[in-house]
Interface confidence: medium
């Protein structure tokens, strides 16, 4: 008779995680009589998966009755497959001995396990940035197999191109992870914007997984400041307003200074939202002109979202306000719109007029 051959007809088998796998193996001869063993991997470190004669293999059963003398089918059935079961399985014929003597191995069947990627998790920058700056968003998904996967980034439905993606590990593994970092340039209108990370994989049957992040968590829109004087009131009081506009987030503290001395401090709260997601706030200060001999320098000082304070000053000319009622008013606006577009070190603006 011809020399025994061990035939594993399938070079590869692909199974979804949780399903069962059948690994086929037949021998061409009953001789020599001796057990079949199944191993995952080859060489000295190979892992015993099933022994026809010994051991307890709760997830593995032989397809046919391998104790039968005439049996030539040594296929096995592995239940409840997980990604950890992936690998190349070898059906190996042994001749009885102490220990049994390996006679011949099959060519191997590669078992690949199709495992779904986890829901993508998108994380944004640790600190907020202002418009025109570039921020990075990271998307991570884990536990998928096979390795081939597609990841796309979108901002408000528009596909992004500035991103880098890595799938790890580079070599063979039971399952893989993907990590992608996208660079997004912020604009003032991005408070309501969203970035989406979309992952497509063979296990998802064309229905990709998505992870999202709101740019509202990453953006800071610094306020515009404008200080104006309202019409002179009858009781020698000047109403000065500080309009703080188009800022985000809402966290803002406003301080009025009269000639450098703190007059009042207020915290913004429960402000109505603009269409673009920003906020406006107006603060009033009543200045009693008759109480002052000299001109009064009013400063509206705004500290937004923990950033260095921004000042806007306004001079009320006391000399232009005779003590009698109905006199003309004159005021000098000495402030400028100061925006913190610059880096932190450049944000301290203190104008003294």
């Amino acid at each position: 008779e011809e020399e025994l051959q061990v035939i594993q007809p399938e070079k590869s088998v692909s199974v979804a995680a949780g399903d069962s796998a059948t690994l086929n193996c037949t021998v061409t001869s009953l001789i020599p009589v001796g057990p079949i063993q199944w191993f995952r991997g080859a060489g000295p470190g190979r892992e015993l998966i099933y022994h026809q004669k010994e051991g307890h293999f709760p997830r593995v059963t032989s397809v046919s009755e391998s104790t039968k003398r005439n049996n030539m089918d040594f296929s096995i059935h592995i239940s409840n497959i997980t990604p950890a079961d992936a690998g190349t399985y070898y059906c190996v014929k042994f001749r009885k001995g102490s220990p049994d003597v390996e006679v011949k191995s099959g060519a191997g069947t590669e078992l690949s396990v199709r495992a779904k990627p986890s829901a993508p998790v998108v994380s944004g920058p640790a600190v907020r940035a202002t418009a025109e700056h570039t921020v990075s968003f990271t998307c991570e998904s884990h536990g998928f197999s096979p390795r081939d996967i597609t990841l796309k980034w979108f901002k408000n439905g528009n596909e992004l191109s500035d991103f880098q993606t890595n799938v790890d590990p580079a070599g063979k593994s039971v399952s893989y992870s993907i990590r992608s970092t996208a660079r997004v340039v912020l604009t003032r209108r991005d408070v309501h914007s969203q970035v989406i990370c979309e992952v497509a994989h063979v296990t998802l049957q064309g229905d990709p997984l998505r992870g999202t992040a709101n740019l509202s968590e990453a953006i800071r829109v610094p306020p515009f400041l404008e200080v104006t004087q309202q019409s002179m009131r009858a009781d020698n009081q000047v109403n000065v307003t500080c309009q703080v506009t188009k800022f985000y987030p809402q966290r803002l503290q406003l301080t009025w200074l009269e000639n450098g001395n703190v007059s009042r401090t207020e915290m913004a709260s429960a402000l109505p939202e603009n269409k673009d997601g920003t906020y406006n706030w107006t603060s009033w200060l009543l200045v009693n002109v008759s109480a002052h001999r000299d001109d009064v320098k009013l400063t509206c000082q705004v500290e937004h979202d923990g950033q260095p304070a921004v000042n806007k000053s306004f001079s009320v000319k006391v000399s232009a306000h005779p003590k009698e009622q109905g006199s003309n008013t004159a005021a000098e606006n000495t402030g400028t719109n100061e925006r913190d577009y610059k880096d932190d070190d450049d944000k301290h603006h203190h104008h003294h007029h």
């Epitope: 001869s29 009589v33 001796g34 057990p35 010994e54 001749r95």
Partner: antibody, heavy 119, light 110 residues
Framework: QVQLVQSGAEVKKPGASVKVSCKAS????????INWVRQAPGQGLEWIAM????????HYNQIFKDRATLTTDTSTSTAYMELRSLRSDDTAVYYC????????????WGRGTLVTVSS | DIVLTQSPDSLAVSLGERATINCRAS??????????IFWYQQKPGQPPKLLIY???NLDSGVPDRFSGSGSGTDFTLTISSLQAEDVAVYYC????????FGQGTKLEIK
């Protein structure tokens, strides 16, 4: 390690039956054939029969086919050999032996059970 | 059924000398290079012990002074240098069909 522990000696009258047990340990009982072999005093080895505990498939020596019955209890990993219609020439040591590699050979042996048939 | 005939029935060999026991099958028990002959050693009061399987393969723990050879119908068990503990009865067995044993060969020291 593989161990086959057999029941104790029996004395039987002609025409009676005897049931010898063989308790296996140290391996997966249902994965190996169990053989039964006897040896009359001062005589050679005589194969009686074999059983596959996984499904109770049996093969008998034609000489014993009508009188011997092999059974197993997989819950206790025990094999049994019953011999009926005993005669004086059935006096022998009865061995159970395990076939490791489906070679129809006997790799591991019990210590034997002496069955004496005497009137 | 296959009949196995051992020769001689008994054998006396001096310590350190070679002992040879033969086993002839009534039909071939060989195929594709594998020979379905097994050799057992039985000492008084003990069960048999497998020495050699598939005609020429030493079972684990068996001293290498024991060897088996042969093919087809004629097989030989050889002890290259007899030791005192080798005194026993030796049996051949075939498994080409259902098992049968040879009648045994008693080995003694001369």
């Amino acid at each position: 390690q593989v161990q086959l522990v057999q029941s104790g000696a029996e004395v039987k009258k002609p025409g009676a039956s005897v049931k010898v047990s063989c308790k296996a340990s140290g391996y997966t009982f249902t994965n190996y054939w169990i053989n039964w072999v006897r040896q009359a005093p001062g005589q050679g080895l005589e194969w009686i029969a074999m059983i596959d505990p996984s499904d109770s498939e049996t093969h008998y020596n034609q000489i014993f086919k009508d009188r011997a019955t092999l059974t197993t209890d997989t819950s206790t990993s025990t094999a049994y050999m019953e011999l009926r219609s005993l005669r004086s020439d059935d006096t022998a040591v009865y061995y159970c032996a395990m076939d490791y590699g489906s070679l129809y050979a006997m790799d591991y042996w019990g210590r034997g059970t002496l069955v004496t048939v005497s009137s | 059924d296959i009949v196995l005939t051992q020769s001689p029935d008994s054998l006396a060999v001096s310590l350190g000398e070679r002992a040879t026991i033969n086993c002839r099958a009534s039909k071939s028990v060989s195929s594709s290079g594998y020979n379905y002959i097994f050799w057992y050693q039985q000492k008084p009061g003990q069960p048999p012990k497998l020495l050699i399987y598939l005609a020429s393969n030493l079972d684990s723990g068996v001293p290498d002074r024991f060897s088996g050879s042969g093919s087809g119908t004629d097989f030989t068990l050889t002890i290259s240098s007899l030791q005192a503990e080798d005194v026993a009865v030796y049996y051949c067995q075939e498994s080409w069909e259902l098992p049968t044993f040879g009648q045994g060969t008693k080995l003694e020291i001369k």
